[in-house]
């Protein structure tokens, strides 16, 4: 008799793929543009990335540091009207893209939560949650919660409102903290909260360090669903050198949880290459005409257009990973086991029941390495075969689909491999 199938876990929509943050509408759409109507025209692009949710804004009225002139129920006319927003929601729904609204109150000011009048602000947020849930949004984000006094209790209250409306609604909180204890204390009182933080932001040094950060986090959070990003808002290039971007894309898409990206992460958008552009929200490079300030600063291979035409580009890798992440059971909700593979490397297996399994091996170092995969670290349910098929490499030159002998696995500097192998009883 065939073994019984393992019961599938309940999956919410944000469990099924990546979230894509557009914090600055104007920067995302480029010079002279930047409104909700224009964003609607970019939904096909988001579909092509196979992201499941768009984290938008803030787009509400906010006069810098002025509580009275901050209205979370009103869209800033610079971004459009409520009708434009409704139209965007409808179009996104048709394309199966959920819309999460950022309600960080004082987003133009010094302190995101104002320095005083915490209760007034909290009440405004509560009213806004109810208003926008009725309007049809799929969730909310609030950032910089380290600046919010009694954050845990407010988050719990806001979570109740969100979940009370529907279990299918999501609340994301963002913090600049990278301290695991602070992160855990925020998570403790909020069961379904998705938290983005700077926890992984200093992980770029070595494979061992990254492995220990990831495993510590997963062990500490138990079987909670988590999210993976390097910060609550900023681009990957703020933290990583160009040669590690592919490696991190592979890692973020294959860890257990929801990967969260900022617009431009898919093309390696880098503010430092665009003089004068703000680090937190540089202009999106759709094509070579997107940055007319200094035309010579932009080459085709830095743009969406140029990378779309190149199967070896970062954007093409992002699309492939996003596709795999959204359709393979082992990546959707599979178990995770990290194991030793030698200094400088981070490797792990993702597996679910009798479905195809995945092996990820990441070389964070700047020298080529032979992987000494320590299968003895793994439980019997996640044993390694002698060979696995190469699904993709972050570097060009390998023959995809070819079987690789795991005992003789060699990785190039900064290379990541995604390998697949079947379940064996």
């Amino acid at each position: 008799r065939a073994p019984r199938c393992r019961e599938l876990p309940a999956q919410k929509w944000w469990h099924t793929g990546a979230l894509y943050r557009i914090g600055d509408l104007q920067a995302f759409q480029g010079h002279g543009a930047g409104n909700l109507a224009g964003l609607k025209g970019r939904l096909d692009y988001l579909s092509s990335l196979k992201v499941k949710g768009l984290v938008l804004g803030p787009i509400h009225k906010n006069q810098k540091d002025d509580v009275a002139q901050t209205d979370l129920l009103q869209i800033d006319p610079n971004f459009g009207s409520k009708e434009d927003f409704d139209s965007l929601l409808q179009s996104a729904k048709k394309k199966s893209i959920r819309v999460i609204l950022d309600l960080t109150p004082n987003y133009r000011g010094e302190n995101s939560w104002f320095s005083t009048q915490v209760d007034t602000v909290a009440t405004k947020v509560k009213d806004a949650l109810e208003f926008w849930l009725q309007a049809g949004v799929d969730g909310f984000q609030v950032r910089d919660i380290e600046n919010l006094k009694d954050a845990s209790s407010f988050l719990a209250e806001w979570q109740n409102i969100t979940k009370g409306f529907s279990e299918d609604r999501l609340l994301i909180a963002g913090t600049n903290s990278s301290d695991l204890q602070q992160i855990l204390s925020l998570l403790e009182s909020n069961k379904d909260l998705l938290l983005t933080s700077s926890y992984l932001s200093d992980s770029g040094s070595t494979g061992e360090h990254t492995k220990s950060l990831v495993t510590q986090y997963l062990n500490a959070t138990g079987n909670r669903w988590c999210s993976w990003s390097l910060s609550q808002a900023r681009l990957l290039t703020s933290f990583l050198p160009a040669q590690l971007l592919r490696l991190y894309q592979l890692m973020l898409f294959t860890l257990p949880g929801t990967p969260v990206f900022s617009y431009g992460d898919e093309i390696g958008l880098d503010a430092a290459a665009l003089p004068g552009q703000p680090m937190e929200a540089p202009v999106m490079l759709w094509d070579e005409s997107s940055f007319p300030d200094i035309p010579g600063a932009v080459s085709a291979n830095m743009t969406v257009k140029g990378q779309s035409e190149d199967p070896g580009s970062l954007l093409s890798l992002f699309r492939r990973l996003s596709d795999q992440r959204s359709k393979e059971r082992s990546l959707l909700h599979g178990d995770f086991h990290a194991f030793s593979a030698g200094p400088g490397l981070f490797s792990y297996i993702r597996h679910w029941d009798q479905n195809e399994r995945f092996l990820v091996v990441l070389n964070f170092g700047d020298v080529g390495l032979s992987a000494g995969l320590q299968a003895s670290d793994l439980p019997a349910s996640a044993s390694l075969p002698a060979k696995a098929d190469l699904l993709l490499s972050t570097q060009p030159g390998r023959e995809e689909g070819s079987p690789l002998e795991l005992e003789r696995l060699k990785l190039e500097p900064h290379e990541g491999l995604l390998l697949r192998f079947p379940y064996a009883a």
Epitope: G276, Q277, P278, E280, E288, P292, D293, I294, A297
Partner: antibody, heavy 125, light 113 residues
Framework: QVQLVQSGAEVKKPGASVKVSCKAS????????MHWVRQAPGQGLEWMGI????????SYAQKFQGRVTMTRDTSTSTVYMELSSLRSEDTAVYYC??????????????????WGQGTMVTVSS | DIVMTQSPDSLAVSLGERATINCKSS????????????LAWYQQKPGQPPKLLIY???TRESGVPDRFSGSGSGTDFTLTISSLQAEDVAVYYC?????????FGQGTRLEIK
């Protein structure tokens, strides 16, 4: 009226650092990029870098990378340029210059419509 | 880096006569997406900071007398003063802003003959 007022002349020894200030008035400080350009005695103009006063992001000419730091203080509408490890070749007049902004398109091409009066920095042992 | 070369290095012209200064860039500064030339001209008088005269190769800055005009495209540009006045004695610089680092020509000294 729109103006940029720079700090006074400085005399420094080789190896030292100098910090020049540039106070803006007559316009919204955070809405325009600021640049630093220097001119050695009897020589041409040399662009050093840019600062966006809104977020503080900077970009420096390769030649000055690692030696120059541009900062700003929005509360006083002032930008600063600090040059370290000074050598005699750094003797020059240092200008802050406001980058142009195209009001219609919001683009900010890098040419300079307003200049400070200049700060003479002399490096000599 | 884009190298800007001006000619002549110095020029003497009689009052009321036409003065022409040339500027050549080592690569094109014409941007095809907006059909604009990323070139500016400045005037610098002794002891003063430079003053913007022309941008986009041919657009006169407000307040600049109409005897100043700019022309050219791609790599070759010209600043023309149609009728030289005494107050036009200065050093003139061209500047490209097509790419960083921003670069200037070496300057052309204009004097009265």
């Amino acid at each position: 009226q729109v103006q940029l007022v720079q700090s006074g002349a400085e005399v420094k020894k080789p190896g030292a650092s100098v910090k020049v200030s540039c106070k803006a008035s007559g316009y919204t400080f955070t809405s325009y990029y600021m640049h630093w350009v220097r001119q050695a005695p009897g020589q041409g103009l040399e662009w050093m870098g840019i600062i966006n006063p809104s977020g503080g992001s900077t970009s420096y000419a390769q030649k000055f990378q690692g030696r120059v730091t541009m900062t700003r203080d929005t509360s006083t509408s002032t930008v600063y340029m600090e040059l370290s490890s000074l050598r005699s070749e750094d003797t020059a007049v240092y200008y802050c210059a406001r980058g142009y902004e195209d009001i219609l398109t919001g683009s900010r091409p890098i040419f300079f419509d307003i200049w400070g009066q200049g700060t003479m920095v002399t490096v000599s042992s | 880096d884009i190298v800007m070369t001006q000619s002549p290095d110095s020029l003497a012209v009689s009052l009321g006569e036409r003065a022409t200064i040339n500027c050549k860039s080592s690569q094109s500064v014409l941007y095809s997406s907006n059909n604009k030339n990323y070139l500016a001209w400045y005037q610098q008088k002794p002891g003063q900071p430079p003053k913007l005269l022309i941008y986009w190769a041919s657009t006169r800055e407000s307040g600049v007398p109409d005897r100043f005009s700019g022309s050219g495209s791609g790599t070759d540009f010209t600043l023309t003063i149609s009728s030289l006045q005494a107050e036009d004695v200065a050093v003139y610089y061209c500047q490209q802003y097509y790419n960083t680092p921003i670069t200037f020509g070496q300057g052309t000294r204009l004097e009265i003959k």
